[in-house]
Interface confidence: medium
């Protein structure tokens, strides 16, 4: 038997396998920004370099005395979780420790920034193989700490951060809220969110995925053969840093976007009980527990997508929400969601050379979310086609008119504030393949892409009876790229993607006043990438 | 994920009336001051001055030096603790909060963030 956490994240077929880079050497280096560590511990001895970097505040209290084993406790444990020879995820990975937390586990934003700069300097002085930076710390939201993470990520460094142990929205903390870091929440042996006293793991749209973070056995700094159990999102982040190190060890050229997409795609889905999270955060929090993915050679050229939620727009009449993909990803579709149902839709626009997903609040609305579907599409060429709103009573049709371009997503944006005019047209013409069909007063946006072997199809599911939501899933081998509520019943809350499932949400009150003829339809656009084939639309 | 969270942003765009320095009076601050929303986590007196992305190495040093000079004219001693060149242009400074208005009006300054605590998780 092995510890539960290792069993959980490393599938059986990986257990004995050694991860080696193509040239036979494992040159991945993990930088740990934490407390001091006990480098002589048998778990990490010989694989850890304790740098001379030290940027910590003074300990509080006049009676505080530094006890080496206490000072080293947090960092030693995490170093062991990442690369410990018995209890580590990426056994044998080289680790460099930078001291940015004092003996009480406290540091500063400035000290962390100087630590990140130290890593960048090291990288410039002596370029090496892939670098992973583990940030098992959190403070309040910091624009500069997030910016520094962004700059470092753009140099090819992979940053992994703890979501935070405050039982709160991770977006309120840094570096957890930085989009360029892989932010990790904590789960226990039952795959449930970790409770820590009165608090627990953070959650929300800034969390990328969860990993084991409760009662994790690892190196204890009390003696060089001692082990201890610790809990927290630091431990969870250390697991993901170890997974990333193993992925990079096998395939050193994987980019941050590829790593994140693969972590999400191969994670264990829907095992977390979402009721633990506040109601307004449940839809935003990923139900994903990390596992070590197979190599790309084993899985072929799958189309990988993830859902990115914007921040809440706020309630003002013209409030907009913006969701962005990572620079390497393609924005294949954009939808929106509002708890009150008062929204004026969504669209894709270019800002500073990057396509972004926007959503607009409506008068009397409590605010909206923009929901972007961000995908890795090699050699893609995507564009947006839009048609202004049609005259009353008419539908608007938009299709991809460029040769070999396929429809990957549709967006609808209403110019009018009056929600009552946005009813389903009395007669809806049969949708033509590869078209977005709008309705009264709606501007329609079609996301059209050309990529080698990309093929897409629409899958719809309608429910006439009372239902809070309608779902439609893409079948195995296909990936959900677009998700919409079709013109639909009065007052839909919007639509969003959860893994390969398209969810269309309907307002409770809308269920009562709907006539039997008005079906709420969830429309999914499902695509796959078959590198040998030509781009095509599947009917 | 990139929007500012529960975060304090204060505009200190006060034109200088303290002395007749032409270049200073001409430059009205568009930079913002930011600090942690959790008061207990703040470290007043230490500030990260973040400069515009394209600021050159020499300009970073000049800006830090200019702040020291102008603070000295007002009878304040400030200490530049660190200069950031490699990840972003900026510097870490220990100074009185009285000087924030002055610092925000310096050329090249994009924003100033008060230092704050981070914690092991």
């Amino acid at each position: 038997s092995i510890p539960w956490n290792l069993e959980r994240i490393i599938p059986a077929w990986h257990q004995t396998e050694e991860d080696r880079s193509p040239d036979g050497s494992s040159q991945v280096e993990v930088y740990l920004l934490d407390t001091s560590i006990q480098g002589a511990h048998r778990e990490i001895e010989g694989r850890v370099t304790i740098t001379d970097f030290n940027s910590v505040p003074e300990e509080d209290g006049t009676r505080f005395h530094r006890q080496a084993s206490k000072c080293d406790s947090h960092g030693t444990h995490l170093a062991g979780v990442v690369s410990g020879r018995d209890a580590g995820v990426a056994k044998g990975t080289s680790l460099h420790s930078l001291r940015v937390l004092n003996c009480q586990g406290k540091g500063t934003v400035s000290g962390t920034l100087i630590g990140l700069e130290f890593i960048r300097k090291s990288q410039l002085i002596q370029p090496s193989g892939p670098l992973v930076v583990l940030l098992p710390l959190a403070g309040g939201y910091s624009r500069i700490l997030n910016a520094a993470c962004r700059h470092l990520a753009r140099t090819g460094v992979v940053l992994v951060a703890a979501a935070g142990n405050f039982r709160d929205d991770a977006c309120l903390y840094s570096p957890a809220s930085a989009p360029e870091v892989i932010t990790v929440g904590a789960t226990n042996a039952q795959d449930q969110p970790v409770t820590l006293g009165t608090l627990g793991t953070n959650f929300g749209r800034c969390v990328d995925l969860f990993a084991p973070g409760k009662d994790i056995i690892g190196a204890s700094s009390d003696c060089s053969t001692c082990f201890m159990s610790q809990s927290g999102t630091s431990q969870a982040a250390a697991h993901v840093a170890g997974i990333v190190a193993r992925m990079l060890s096998r395939e050193p050229t994987l980019t941050l976007a590829e790593l994140r997409q693969r972590l999400i795609h191969f994670s264990t889905k829907d095992v977390i009980n979402m009721a633990w999270f506040p109601e307004d955060q449940q839809v935003l929090t990923p139900n994903l527990v990390a596992t070590l993915p197979p190599s790309t050679h084993e899985t072929g050229g799958q189309l990988l997508c993830r859902t990115v939620w914007s921040a809440h727009s706020g309630p003002t009449r013209t409030a907009t929400a913006t969701a962005r993909c990572a620079p390497e990803e393609e924005l294949l579709s954009c939808s929106s969601f509002s708890r009150s149902g008062r929204r004026r839709g969504d669209w894709i626009e270019a800002i500073g050379g990057q396509q972004v997903c926007k959503a607009l609040n409506a008068f009397g609305g409590e605010g909206v979310y923009a929901v972007a579907r961000c995908c890795l599409v090699p050699r893609a060429n995507c564009s947006i086609h839009n048609t202004p709103a049609a005259r009353a009573g008419l539908e608007t049709h938009v299709h991809c008119h460029q040769k070999d371009h396929v429809l990957t997503g549709c967006s609808f944006h209403w110019e009018v504030e009056d929600l009552s005019v946005r009813r389903q047209p009395a007669l809806r013409s049969r949708r033509q393949p590869g078209q977005c069909v709008g309705h009264q007063a709606a501007s329609v946006y079609a996301s059209c892409c050309h990529a080698p072997g990309l093929e897409c199809k629409i899958k719809e599911h309608g429910i006439s009876g009372p239902s809070e939501q309608v779902t439609v899933a893409c079948e195995a081998g296909w990936t959900l790229t677009g998700c919409n509520v079709l013109p639909g019943a009065s007052l839909t809350l919007g639509a969003y993607s959860v893994d390969n499932l398209c969810v269309a949400r309907v307002h409770d009150t809308a269920r009562a006043d709907r006539t039997s003829g008005e079906a709420t339809v969830a429309a999914a656009i499902c695509c796959r990438s078959r590198p040998s084939a030509k781009a095509s639309w599947v009917q | 994920q990139d929007e500012d969270g529960d975060y304090e942003e204060l505009m200190l765009a006060l034109p200088s009336q303290e002395d007749g320095l032409a270049d200073e009076a001409a430059h009205v601050a568009t930079a913002t001051f930011r600090r942690c929303s959790k008061e207990a986590w703040r470290l007043p007196g230490t500030y990260i001055v973040v400069l515009m992305e394209e600021t050159q190495r020499l300009q970073i040093e000049q800006t830090a030096h200019r702040l020291q000079t102008r603070a000295a004219r007002r009878g304040y001693v400030i200490k530049v603790l660190h200069i950031f060149y490699d990840l972003f242009p900026g510097f870490l400074v220990k100074m009185s909060s009285d000087l924030l208005g002055l610092a925000l009006k310096l050329p090249h300054v994009e924003y100033i963030e008060e230092d704050s605590f981070v914690f092991a998780q």
């Epitope: 038997s1 018995d86 204890s220 009390d222 003696c223 053969t225 001692c226 082990f227 201890m228 159990s229 | -």
Partner: antibody
Framework: QVQLVQSGAEVKKPGSSVKVSCKAS????????ISWVRQAPGQGLEWMGG????????NYAQKFQGRVTITADESTSTAYMELSSLRSEDTAVYYC????????????????????????WGQGTLVTVSS | DIQMTQSPSSLSASVGDRVTITCRAS??????LNWYQQKPGKAPKLLIY???TLQSGVPSRFSGSGSGTDFTLTISSLQPEDFAVYYC????????FGQGTKVEIK
């Protein structure tokens, strides 16, 4: 008091493998780790490796890595040591020994001290490797 | 690996003598050291653990001291049953034993 009873003496050919068992009685088997220590004729003691119940995995001395496998069967309270690719230098008395692993609370966490302190020993098993 | 060096490798003493055996570690091991006694044809027996703590059932004439790299086992008044081989063993890293000290009758 835990008693450790080992399997009987073995004579093996070079290149073959040997598997020695060690059965515990009295006390809880899984709450303590088992190590294997050998002693060549007229020589000192040499630790080969041990089972760590906290991690549920075995640790091996560098010298024996890849050649020794230590396992434990909780249902029968028995530990095993298998040594492969035997050579004449492996002729020795092989002892199993219970080592301590103590759990204490510290800084609000549990610390497991993996004390390689051998208080109970088996009677020893002589393995002779000869062609 | 941490090397343990015992001295002397053998000594001759009489009943009632005070006997001291030393053990030196190749690097600091705090107080992670145990002492064992082994008689011919028998398994070793734990005498002292953690450098200086007497194992229950062991006579009080046995004592241990030291920390870091230098350790000492002392038998305050040698008894006939104490003639045996004594081993030190560190557990700060993977366990390693000293080469042994044989205490013989003079």
């Amino acid at each position: 008091q835990v008693q450790l009873v080992q399997s009987g003496a073995e004579v093996k050919k070079p290149g073959s493998s040997v598997k020695v068992s060690c059965k515990a009685s009295g006390g809880t088997f899984n709450s303590h780790a088992i190590s294997w220590v050998r002693q060549a004729p007229g020589q000192g003691l040499e630790w080969m490796g041990g089972i760590n119940p906290i991690l549920g995995i075995a640790n091996y001395a560098q010298k024996f890595q890849g050649r020794v496998t230590i396992t434990a069967d909780e249902s029968t309270s028995t530990a095993y040591m298998e040594l492969s690719s035997l050579r004449s230098e492996d002729t020795a008395v092989y002892y199993c020994a219970r080592h301590y692993e103590i759990q204490i609370g510290r800084y609000g966490m549990n610390v497991y001290y993996l004390m390689y302190r051998f208080a109970s020993w088996g009677q020893g098993t002589l393995v002779t490797v000869s062609s | 690996d941490i090397q343990m060096t015992q001295s002397p490798s053998s000594l001759s003493a009489s009943v009632g003598d005070r006997v001291t055996i030393t053990c030196r570690a190749s690097q600091g091991i705090r107080s992670a050291l145990n002492w064992y006694q082994q008689k011919p044809g028998k398994a070793p027996k734990l005498l002292i653990y953690n450098g200086s703590t007497l194992q229950s059932g062991v006579p009080s004439r046995f004592s241990g001291s030291g920390s870091g790299t230098d350790f000492t086992l002392t038998i305050s008044s040698l008894q006939p049953e104490d003639f045996a081989v004594y081993y030190c063993q560190q557990f700060d890293g993977d366990p390693t034993f000293g080469q042994g000290t044989k205490v013989e009758i003079k």
